[in-house]
Interface confidence: low
């Protein structure tokens, strides 16, 4: 189970993980105390037949080719959490592990 | 964490799970002994802003809008295995649980 890593200069058109830093202040998300910025990464690229397909199911649907099936798309296949300090809806300060905030690997599904 | 279920008569354009029966014999996959057919299901539809987004990360990438990010796509968010009887590469008969063969839920990621 592997995935490609790229950057903005890459010539890779296939499904790949790209670096992306999310800046909460730039979004106006002032309820987040820390971190103000973090490395989130994102997935982009084309999913050609069988390339980086995570599940056998993806291949089977391609074979069966039902109406409306758009083919696999490039999406996170492994994600990890980050620890965050933030205000909840009751203005209480919460420290917690927020799941699925960082993309570790991209694939076609 | 929920997802929409549709069928071929549905007018739903958003991300939805559709029924699909995979027929191994029709594919010529003669190394699969059983089942010959199974209900695999598949995901199809549009991912509008925030609709059925599985991860907060998806929303953040949409906000940051990096080059080449295509927006979320409709993809399996919950899958389950099936038990299969099949020949392996050495012509041995294997009975095993094959992961991620059935789509239980679809979402935008």
């Amino acid at each position: 189970d592997f995935g490609l890593d790229c950057d903005e200069h890459s010539t890779e058109s296939r499904c790949c993980r790209y670096p992306l830093t999310v800046d909460f202040e730039a979004f106006g998300w002032d309820w987040i105390i820390a971190p103000k910025r973090y490395k989130a990464n994102y997935c982009s690229g084309e999913c050609e037949f069988v390339f980086l397909q995570k599940y056998p199911h993806t291949h089977l649907v391609h074979q069966a080719n039902p109406r409306g099936s758009a083919g696999p798309c490039c999406t996170p296949t492994k994600m990890s959490p980050i620890n965050m300090l933030y205000f909840n809806g009751k203005e209480q300060i919460i420290y917690g592990k927020i799941p699925a905030m960082v993309v570790d690997r991209c694939g076609c599904s | 964490d929920f997802g929409l279920d549709c069928d071929e008569h549905s007018t739903e354009s958003r991300c939805c799970r559709y029924p699909l029966t995979v027929d191994f014999e029709a594919f010529g996959w003669d190394w699969i002994i059983a089942p010959k057919r199974y209900k695999a299901n598949y995901c199809s539809g549009e991912c509008e802003f925030v609709f059925l987004q599985k991860y907060p990360h998806t929303h953040l990438v949409h906000q940051a809008n990096p080059r080449g990010s295509a927006g979320p796509c409709c993809t399996p968010t919950k899958m389950s295995p099936i038990n299969m009887l099949y020949f392996n590469g050495k012509e041995q008969i294997i009975y095993g649980k094959i992961p991620a063969m059935v789509v239980d839920r679809c979402g935008c990621s």
Epitope: H9, G45 | A70
Partner: antibody, heavy 119, light 107 residues
């Protein structure tokens, strides 16, 4: 057998337009990025433009940006290069070449079509 | 933009000679480099991909090496049919860039 056949070249006046085509056969065209490369008479090879398999990613050399447009029709197994505001320095043999990352990078080329820009 | 400096621009060698052509990238490009042979009036033909992998059907006297910024194409024993112009191509970043070419002549 993989085949790429360019057409559409010819003589055109400066400032004129031309549309090149590349007909592909013998492989799954829709799975490959495609490229145009040119070669001026007696000179070296120059990459012109690339288009990814489903047209999501398009790149141009600075020398043609804003004047040339690359496109493809996967249903017709065809690649195109629309060339506008042609200049004398665009005179070259234009080749199409297929590409799918390192292993398939420019592994097959067409025979080329000559574009001459002259008054 | 990435610059690819190829040397020499031309060379003349005898049949059986070992010939070496080099390509230098202005920045590191891992092994994202190919070598191409072009004969007059013909389309280029790929010899090497991934800096060192031999294209199927290409004679084993051709070999490629290098990584990062320095790359070499070697013809271990020059043959008459090797008379051609050779180009390197980097595909690490856009714009894709070719080296200036090396014209190989047989003495």
């Amino acid at each position: 057998e993989v085949q790429l056949v360019e057409s559409g070249g010819g003589l055109v006046k400066p400032g004129g337009s031309l549309r090149l085509s590349c007909a592909a056969s013998g492989f799954t065209f829709s799975s490959y990025s495609m490229n145009w490369v040119r070669q001026a008479p007696g000179k070296g090879l120059e990459w012109v433009s690339s288009i990814s398999s489903s047209s999501s990613y398009i790149y141009y050399a600075d020398s043609v940006k804003g004047r040339f447009t690359i496109s493809r029709d996967n249903a017709k197994n065809s690649l195109y290069l629309q060339m506008n505001s042609l200049r004398a320095e665009d005179t070259a043999v234009y080749y199409c070449a297929r590409d799918r990352g390192s292993y398939f990078l420019f592994d097959y080329w067409g025979q080329g079509t000559l574009v001459t820009v002259s008054s | 933009d990435m610059q690819m400096t190829q040397s020499p621009s031309s060379l003349s060698a005898s049949v059986g000679d070992r010939v070496t052509i080099t390509c230098r990238a202005s920045q590191g490009i891992r092994n994202d480099l190919g070598w191409y042979q072009q004969k007059p009036g013909k389309a280029p033909k790929r010899l090497i991909y991934g800096a060192s992998s031999l294209q199927s059907g290409v004679p084993s006297r051709f070999s490629g090496s290098g990584s990062g910024t320095e790359f070499t194409l070697t013809i271990s024993s020059l043959q008459p049919e090797d008379s051609a112009t050779y180009y390197c191509l980097q595909h690490n970043s856009y714009p894709l860039t070719f080296g200036g070419g090396t014209k190989v002549e047989i003495k």
